[in-house]
Structures are given as C-alpha cells and as structure tokens.
C-alpha cells in the first residue's frame, strides 16, 4: 500500500481467482483513543472499533472510503483504491491502446517546436467517475523540472456504438534551450482513477522525436504565363522555432484531386516556393518537416487549384 | 521551371555542403547498424545516450544563434579555448565567436574520427564480420575537417592490447552513432545559419 495523495491510498493486488489479497491496517487520524468506530462508504454498518482497523483487501467491494467516527462525529477518512496486477502485468483497463506508433501506446505526445512545450493526449470510453493527474520530468534519477497543467477533455467522438473521449494536457520544461542536444528523455506519468480502480501510464521521449510542425501558413498561387504551371509560395508557421535559418524546415508540395487514388503531382523542396502543375478540381497542399531531423510531417495546408 | 529564389551562393560557405553530406552519411550508417544489429540494443529507446565530447568541447554553446543568446537556459558557462584560424568563411567575416564555434566543431569531428577508427579496427577482427564502419562516413568526416582547416595536435589512435569484446564494441558503436547523428544535426543547423548570415 502507498499514499497517492493525502488520505488516498493505493493497494496493489495480484489479481487471480482465490487470491489471498492484501492485509491493510488503517489508522484513524485523531488524538482520541477510544469510542472510535469504522464504516465504509455510505453504509452505517460498523466494521470495527478502535484507533486502527485491519482489513483483508481482495476485491473492489473491499475498496472505498473508510471513515472513523466518534459519537456521530467524523474524525478522518481513508480512500482505498485498487491497482490490479494480472500475470505480472499492471492492468490498463481505463485507457485505450492507440496502437500508434506501436502496440501498447496509451499516451501520445507532440511538440510544435523545440521550446520545451509539448502536448500529450489519451483516449478512453469511460465518461464518468474519472480523474487524471499528470507529472513530468526530464530524466528519472536526477529529475529536472517540467510543469504540466490539468488534464482536460479535449474531444468526443462516436466510434461505432461507443463514444470515445480524448483527454489532453500541456506541459512545459522549466528551463529549455531550443538548441540543446537532449541526452535525457522527458518522462510523463499519468495517474488514472476510475471509481475505485487506480492505473498509471508512462511515456518516455525526446522532444526531437515528437516534433510535428504546424502546417505552413499563407499559401498563395501565382499562375505562370502561357503554362499550366503555377508557382505556389508559403511561409513558415508562426509556432516554429526561430531563427528559421537554424531551425530549417523542408516541404512537400502536392497537387491532388479529392480522392487519394487520383493522380498527383508531388515535389519536395527546402525553399518556400515551388512550381507545380494545377488541374481543375484539384487542390495544392503543402506540409512541413524538420529539415535535419526527420520526425513527423505537419498536417497539410491546402488551397484549391482554381 | 522553378523561378529563381534568392539564396546565398554555396561557394561562400563550402562547409554547408560537407555538413549535409555528413548528416546523410551518419544517418545511413545508423540505419544500417540498426538493421544489421537488430538483436542488439541499438534503438534510441534502448541505448544510453552518451556524449564523448562532453566537457571537452562546447559546440552547442559556442555555435548558439545570436537570437538564442538572450535565452538564459541556453547559456552554459563552460569555458573552453580554441584555435582560431578556420577557413570555412572568408577571414574578414570570421568573428572570434564564429572561429570558436567552427573550431569546436572541428574538435568534435576529430574526437569522433579517432573513436570510429579505433572501433573499426576492432570490428575488423570480429570473426562474424557482422558490421564495419562505412568508409564513406569516415571520408565525409575527413572532408569536413579539411574544409574547416584547423591546425591542432593529432590525437593518437587508441590501441588496446586486450581481446576485444565484440558484443560491447557493437553496443558502443550504436551509442556513438546515435550521439554523432545528434551532433551532425547541430552542425548542419549551424552551417545553415552561418550560410544565411
């Protein structure tokens, strides 16, 4: 058993049929010595008396809010949560496996630049009685500070018969140098509590590996005389690290119709303009990627050919 | 046809071309190592990230873009002295800071060159003959060092009398290549920045 926060405790259980469970001793936070009784949740049934209560925790029915009273007055609470371990593996029932970039990916994180700010998100099908708490650091043995905000519900989607909820959190490394060469990864730890179930999820990464620039901005087309060719120009996204001559981007320019199966014109360039062939009912799209360290491409910025 | 875009003449800054070749060569070598040594811990997640130049050079700090010198997190107070006669830029343009930066890059390259050559000598003794360093990568390091044209003492190649542990050598190769790739990215950014300046 360990303390998650004040008056909230996590009991780690090996989860298999007829498991013996864990013996837990609760102590009432009071100077009183006698006349103390214990109850669980909203029940008035007295579970025991005395300053301490010893219980055998085997299943979710044994978890919950234990309260010690004296003469009708509440003295203190202890909330017990369960953390299940099945076949030596901690349960991951609360969050959905995003399977990208690999299986068992519950947390996904992205950064728009090298400033040390990043966003992580996760998915669940659970809609109520759900809380998250996020901590982060640079390195684990001698951790350096990363400050994370509160996790918030950022999107809801319908997936077949199920509703899916996306939560996200923004974090900022306390003293980040955009030009630094990272040798210690960022660690992100998410505590998830659903009703009386506790789970924790972690992710470890270098900012350089989670970079995904915003799409290029201000796409403009200039038709070339006596030609089907157009010159397309754009600018670096505002959120990208500066100076741009140091943090350079490379671009992919594509002309394509509405369907992905349609024919296309595609060219890669380090410049902020390119010449392509425009077709009726097609769109010109441009996306960006760090020129020197190939992490993710940005989403496309598009303008219609016409 | 692409319309002309105002870009600096690459002749002004010969090191830019060499640094691009360097990043390409080390990236290819790292990819080859990851494929060949697939049963060794050779991915970014599996290895320890060590920097053999730590406390010996200060390339990131010495080559910091002016715009980032206002960022206190970027200013590490590591004092290192360097030789200042680089030839990558015409001498009239070579400020003291730039010479410091280029000589720091030169020292990085020299250190990695020695490590890679020592390691290759060990790998050549491996009866499995599983992996060797790409001669192209070694040549590209050499070309960039020549373009930087700094005079400094030659570092003797480390020789070891004991039997090499090939497993450890291959793991060290992965660690070195990962670190060198990160440094090559910094070098490329620096050259691009100097070229634009």
């Amino acid at each position: 058993i360990w303390e998650l926060k004040k008056d909230v405790y996590v009991v780690e259980l090996d989860w298999y049929p007829d498991a013996p469970g864990e013996m837990v001793v609760l102590t009432c936070d009071t100077p009183e010595e006698d006349g103390i009784t214990w109850t669980l949740d909203q029940s008035s049934e007295v579970l025991g008396s005395g300053k301490t209560l010893t219980i055998q925790v085997k299943e979710f029915g044994d978890a919950g809010q234990y309260t010690c009273h004296k003469g009708g007055e509440v003295l203190s609470h202890s909330l017990l949560l369960l953390h299940k371990k099945e076949d030596g593996i901690w349960s991951t029932d609360i969050l959905k496996d995003q399977k990208e970039p690999k299986n068992k990916t519950f947390l996904r994180c992205e950064a728009k630049n090298y400033s040390g700010r990043f966003t992580c998100w996760w998915l669940t099908t659970i809609s109520t009685d759900l809380t998250f708490s996020v901590k982060s650091s640079r390195g684990s043995s001698d951790p350096q500070g990363v400050t994370c905000g509160a996790a918030t519900l950022s999107a809801e989607r319908v997936r077949g018969d199920n509703k899916e909820y996306e939560y996200s959190v923004e974090c900022q490394e306390d003293s980040a140098c955009p030009a630094a060469e990272e040798s210690l990864p960022i660690e992100v730890m998410v505590d998830a509590v659903h009703k009386l179930k506790y789970e924790n999820y972690t992710s470890s990464f270098f900012i350089r590996d989670i970079i995904k620039p915003d799409p290029p901005k201000n796409l403009q087309l200039k038709p070339l005389k006596n030609s089907r060719q157009v010159e397309v120009s754009w600018e670096y996204p505002d959120t990208w690290s500066t100076p741009h001559s140091y943090f350079s981007l490379t671009f992919c320019v594509q002309v394509q119709g509405k369907s992905k199966r349609e024919k296309k014109d595609r060219v890669f360039t380090d410049k902020t303009s390119a010449t392509v062939i425009c077709r009726k009912n097609a769109s010109i799209s441009v996306r960006a990627q760090d020129r020197y360290y190939s992490s993710s491409w940005s989403e496309w910025a598009s303008v219609p050919c016409s | 046809r692409n319309l002309p875009v105002a870009t600096p003449d690459p002749g002004m800054f010969p090191c830019l071309h060499h640094s691009q070749n360097l990043l390409r060569a080390v990236s290819n070598m790292l990819q080859k190592a990851r494929q060949t040594l697939e049963f060794y811990p050779c991915t970014s997640e599996e290895i320890d990230h060590e920097d053999i130049t730590k406390d010996k050079t200060s390339t990131v700090e010495a080559c910091l873009p002016l715009e980032l010198t206002k960022n206190e997190s970027c200013l590490n107070s590591r004092e290192t002295s360097f030789i200042t006669n680089g030839s990558c830029l015409a001498s009239r343009k070579t400020s003291f800071m730039m010479a410091l930066c280029l000589s720091s890059i030169y020292e990085d390259l020299k250190m990695y060159q020695v490590e890679f050559k020592t390691m290759n000598a060990k790998l050549l003794m491996d009866p499995k003959r599983q992996i060797f360093l790409d001669q192209n990568m070694l040549a590209v390091i050499d070309e960039l060092m020549q373009a930087l044209n700094f005079n400094s003492e030659t570092v003797p190649q480390k020789s070891s009398l004991e039997e090499p542990d090939f497993y450890k050598t291959k793991i060290k190769l992965c660690i070195l290549l990962h670190a060198f790739r990160i440094r090559a990215v910094t070098i490329d950014r620096v050259m691009s920045y100097l070229n634009a300046s």
Epitope: K263, K264, V267, K280 | R1
Partner: antibody
Framework: QVQLVQSGAEVKKPGSSVKVSCKAS????????LHWVRQAPGQGLEWMGW????????EYAPKFQGRVTITADESTSTAYMELSSLRSEDTAVYYC???????????WGQGTLVTVSS | DIVMTQSPLSLPVTPGEPASISCRAS??????LHWYQQKPGQAARLLIA???QSISGVPSRFSGSGSGTDFTLTISSLQPEDFATYYC?????????FGQGTKVEIK
C-alpha cells in the same frame, strides 16, 4: 495487370513525320499521366513530354517543342506521339510510360524502334 | 535544364559483393530523384522513388540515399539478375532529365 502495348517498328525518311501509338489496358486510362521517353542506340534515356488524358494537358521538353505532339484518345485508351521533321539523330527506341505520379514513371511500354534513314 | 551526372559509367562487380552508384545534380533538387534499372532490349524498371523510398516488388537489397545534389544507389549484394544499366532521374523541375547511365557488369 497494367500494360502498355506500342505500335510496331517504323523506318522513315529524313524530313518526314512518325506517329507511334500506345494502347493501355488495366486500370482507367485517364487515371494516369502518360509520358514519352526515347533512347538512341547505345545511349541513355531522354524525356520528351507528358499528357494528361483526362483533359489533354501536355508539357514538352524544350528540345522537342514545336516538333512533337502528344495526343490521347480516351475512347480507345490510346496515346499517340507524333514527331515531325525527322533527322537521322531521331533514330531511337521510343517508349510510352505511365504513372499516377506526374514526375516519375512506374510502368513502361515495350518500346517502338524508329529508324530515320535516307 | 538540370544536368544529372552519374559515376562510374561502368562498374565491374563480383556477384555477392555490394555495389554503389553515384548521381550528382547540377543544382539542388532536394529528394526529387528516382532510380531505374534497364536490361538490354527491355524497358526500364522503377527501383527507388524520391531518393530513398522503396517500391513494392523491388528486392530489399536495393536502397537509395541522398538529398540536395548528391545521391547514391546501393545494391547490398549483387545477384546475377542485377547486372544491368542503372539510371537516375530528377523530378525537381521540367524538363525531367536522366543521368547517362551506369552499366554494372560481371567482374
């Protein structure tokens, strides 16, 4: 299986014209860009131009501008390349080729040898 | 027009050994570079698109690298069926242009 079948070999006199055909099968004809590339005996590949069969748009290499005409007939899934004012150095194997990507080629015809000789 | 220069023009290789072909562009072309294989009397076959993207159906022993002006096609271990002429082609701008070809022959 995408296939491009070209017309047979031709022998032409200098100053005359030649029209080579290329019939496509497999896939929708207008879903691909069609290119013409030639190869003189013992020489390398030389791009001549492309056509978008969907709208008839064409682009020619400056070297052939004014001498080459590429056309396409959607109803028969056939493309044509006509080269006029032939000279001996136009002796080559002419390939039609196609791709959904405009700027490179993934399927080639078997080639048509055009010999220009007096 | 962008001029593509291949080297060497002839490359004698022992079967089973690796081979590398170089292609240089007269100006920077990013990764707009493609590689083809051509056997005598046959049409060309696409091997690599955009400098390093592998093409389905092409054996994994063929790989490409490079960007800007310098590109390399590598065959990790030459098989008897790989003896052919190899061409690079730039797609950065029209007209599309090819290298003059590299003939890989049995040593």
């Amino acid at each position: 299986q995408v296939q491009l079948v070209q017309s047979g070999a031709e022998v032409k006199k200098p100053g005359s014209s030649v029209k080579v055909s290329c019939k496509a099968s497999g896939g929708t004809f207008s879903d691909y860009y069609l290119h013409w590339v030639r190869q003189a005996p013992g020489q390398g590949l030389e791009w001549m131009g492309w056509i978008d069969p969907e709208n008839g748009d064409t682009e020619y290499a400056p070297k052939f501008q004014g001498r080459v005409t590429i056309t396409a007939d959607e109803s028969t899934s056939t493309a044509y390349m006509e080269l006029s004012s032939l000279r001996s150095e136009d002796t080559a194997v002419y390939y039609c080729a196609r791709n959904k990507e405009l700027r490179y080629i993934d399927v080639w015809g078997q080639g048509t040898l055009v010999t220009v000789s007096s | 027009d962008i001029v593509m220069t291949q080297s060497p023009l002839s490359l004698p290789v022992t079967p089973g050994e690796p081979a590398s072909i170089s292609c240089r562009a007269s100006q920077s072309i990013s990764i707009n570079l493609h590689w083809y294989q051509q056997k005598p009397g046959q049409a060309a076959r696409l091997l690599i698109a955009f400098a390093s993207q592998s093409i389905s159906g092409v054996p994994s022993r063929f790989s490409g690298s490079g960007s800007g002006t310098d590109f390399t096609l590598t065959i990790s271990s030459l098989q008897p069926e790989d003896f052919a002429t190899y061409y690079c082609q730039q797609s950065n701008s029209f007209p599309l242009t090819f290298g003059q070809g590299t003939k890989v022959e049995i040593k």
